[in-house]
């Protein structure tokens, strides 16, 4: 039987069950390498609290439809009368990297994952030549996730004094040209995450190969290597790699760009301080507030929630959103669909999109950026759910009693975009980190 | 105050049964995973079973197939149904409740001998 998602198949991949301290390690293609979990497993669960192994999914009873894999295993569970087997779930959504398999809940007899990654897609518009894993788990089992940086077009420009040569990189997937073909990075080769331009010419000095690495509990590190065998002529004999480390700073601040701090022989060390290598309950919340001891911050944007079935309108040129943002609260427009964001078509108003759902909801502030995000809307013809981005400002005269009001600026493959300037927006900063 | 107590535990004969009680207090008992040890005389603590908050469990090879953990959230108790009983298995028996937000608590624990 074929590997159902091949692109996932080179890596084991974690996850993890905050609430009970367990750590899961997936392959899906082949087996884990964790002799306590036998030589089959493909899902195996470390218990920390107990320092055992169980393996709760093998990689001989797997079925895979397109969107759905399933690990059985022969070891029976306790469901009274019956004779169930312990298994795991993982559902495949569209994404647009890699992502991670996030656990989602475990019953007596199933343990239940969620990933959205490019290799759930119907169409290949997302998918990178090369991506690896972009996120860690630190000691403490906190989660350290950089996907948010990866560009799916064009590069970042590292921060370097020379002035004959710039460096542009990726996070964990090569340089995407063909999308965002800017002047500099066109003639960067295919499959390079970190391009030297020097006038008109570009080299490739790195490809991704491994995923990303935690080497103490602030300081993550991504290395580049070029692959194939011909060495460029201005690295004296030497194969150029190029180690990105991220550096999660000690307290909060704005976002910085990546620095160059070392260049020898074409081995490029970069250093990035960027709060996206913290880990994500310091960035993150589920609710409209980030506030407490975790995140050294008071943000709550719980006051713009609408009630009495009004919503925001913003206009998009073809068609209208209508948003309600931090609430439970139906768009009337929008037939049930439990959306936060609510496209309507200005031509055909029965034509009707959730853009991004109520429940599916993350408030992120990291490098100085306040967003809220909403995925899990209506598909696109992709396979990839719709999702809206609001950008939040500061703006303590805003109007509409300070709650001021969303204006959307674009769509970028089902990824709707939306700037909101209002005085809730408006962050208080504590000290001790 | 938070505490965990034991009950349940005694004499019984190769082969036979007891139920274990751990009634907790002073937690939200439904977001705690809770895990049964148990220690031999002379020997190390061991692991005997664990049942997360979610509802999954696990159990020592040991005790595969002739122990059962259990929970009635409405009675803030945990048990463990010990059946096919050995002599190996006489041990002081604890409980454990363990979430994100507490420190692990554990009981005084509760004796079992199994002995004809």
């Known amino acids: 039987q074929a590997a159902p998602f091949p692109e996932l198949c080179s890596y084991t991949w974690e996850a993890v069950d905050t609430k009970n301290n367990v750590l899961y390690k997936i392959n899906i293609c082949g087996s884990v390498d964790i002799v306590q979990c036998g030589p089959s497993s493909a899902v195996c669960m470390h218990d920390l609290k107990t320092r055992t192994y169980h393996s709760v999914g093998d990689s001989v009873l797997r079925s895979a439809t397109r969107s759905l894999l399933e690990f059985n295993t022969t070891v029976s569970c306790d469901q009274q009368g019956t004779n169930h087997r312990v298994q795991s779930s993982i559902a495949f959504l569209c994404g647009k990297t890699l992502g991670t398999p996030e656990f989602v809940t475990a019953t007596e007899c199933v343990h239940y994952f969620e990933w959205r990654t490019t290799a759930a897609c119907k169409k290949d518009i997302f998918k990178a030549n090369k991506e690896v894993p972009c996120y860690v788990f630190d000691e403490e089992l906190r989660k350290h996730d950089l996907n948010p940086l990866i560009k799916l077009s064009g590069a970042y420009l590292v921060d370097d004094s020379d002035p004959d040569t710039s460096l542009f990189i990726n996070v964990c997937r090569d340089i995407d040209t063909l999308r965002d073909p800017g002047s500099q990075l066109r003639a960067c080769p295919p499959g390079t995450a970190a391009c030297l331009v020097r006038g008109h010419q570009a080299f490739d000095v790195g490809q991704p190969r491994d995923g990303l690495k935690v080497v103490r509990k602030d300081r993550l590190v991504l290395s580049y290597v070029r692959e194939e065998a011909g060495k460029l002529d201005f690295c004296d004999g030497h194969s150029p790699a190029v180690t990105i480390t991220f550096v999660c700073p000690s307290e909060r601040r704005e976002g910085t760009i990546p620095k160059l701090t070392a260049k020898s022989n074409c081995r490029y060390e970069i250093e990035w301080i960027t709060e996206y290598a913290c880990h994500r309950d310091y960035l993150e919340s589920k609710t409209c507030s980030l506030s407490g001891e975790q995140q050294d911050v008071s943000i709550d944007l719980t006051p713009l929630a609408q009630s009495g079935g009004s919503s925001y309108i913003s206009d998009g040129k073809e068609y209208l959103f209508y948003l309600n943002v931090c609430g439970e609260t139906e768009i009337q427009f929008c037939n049930k669909k439990q959306a936060a964001v609510c496209q309507v078509k200005k031509s055909d108003t029965s034509q009707v999109k959730a853009a991004g759902r109520y429940h599916n909801q993350t408030l992120r502030y990291s490098d100085g950026d306040l967003t809220l995000i909403y995925f899990g809307g209506d598909e696109c013809s992709s396979g990839f759910q719709r999702m809206s981005v609001i950008n939040f400002e500061c703006n303590k005269t805003a109007g509409n009693d300070g709650k001021g009001t969303p204006v959307f600026t674009g769509e970028v493959d089902c990824t709707y975009e939306f700037t909101w300037d209002t005085e809730y927006a408006c962050v208080h900063h504590h000290h001790h980190h | 105050d938070v505490q965990l107590v034991e009950s349940g535990g005694g004499l019984v004969q190769p082969g036979g049964s007891l139920r274990l009680s751990c009634a907790a207090s002073?937690?939200?008992?439904?977001?705690?995973?809770m895990d049964w040890y148990r220690q031999a005389p002379g020997k190390q603590r061991e692991w005997v079973a664990t049942l997360a908050s979610y509802g999954w469990k696990t159990y020592a090879d040991s005790v595969k197939g002739r122990f059962t953990i259990s929970r009635d959230n409405a009675k803030n108790t945990v048990y463990l149904q010990m059946n096919s009983l050995r002599p190996e298995d006489t041990a002081v028996y604890y409980c454990?409740?363990?979430?994100?937000?507490?420190?692990?608590?554990w009981g005084q624990g509760t004796l079992v001998t199994v002995s004809s």
């Open positions: 454990k409740a363990s979430s994100p937000v507490l420190n692990d608590i």
């Open positions: 002073g937690i939200i008992f439904s977001d705690n995973r």
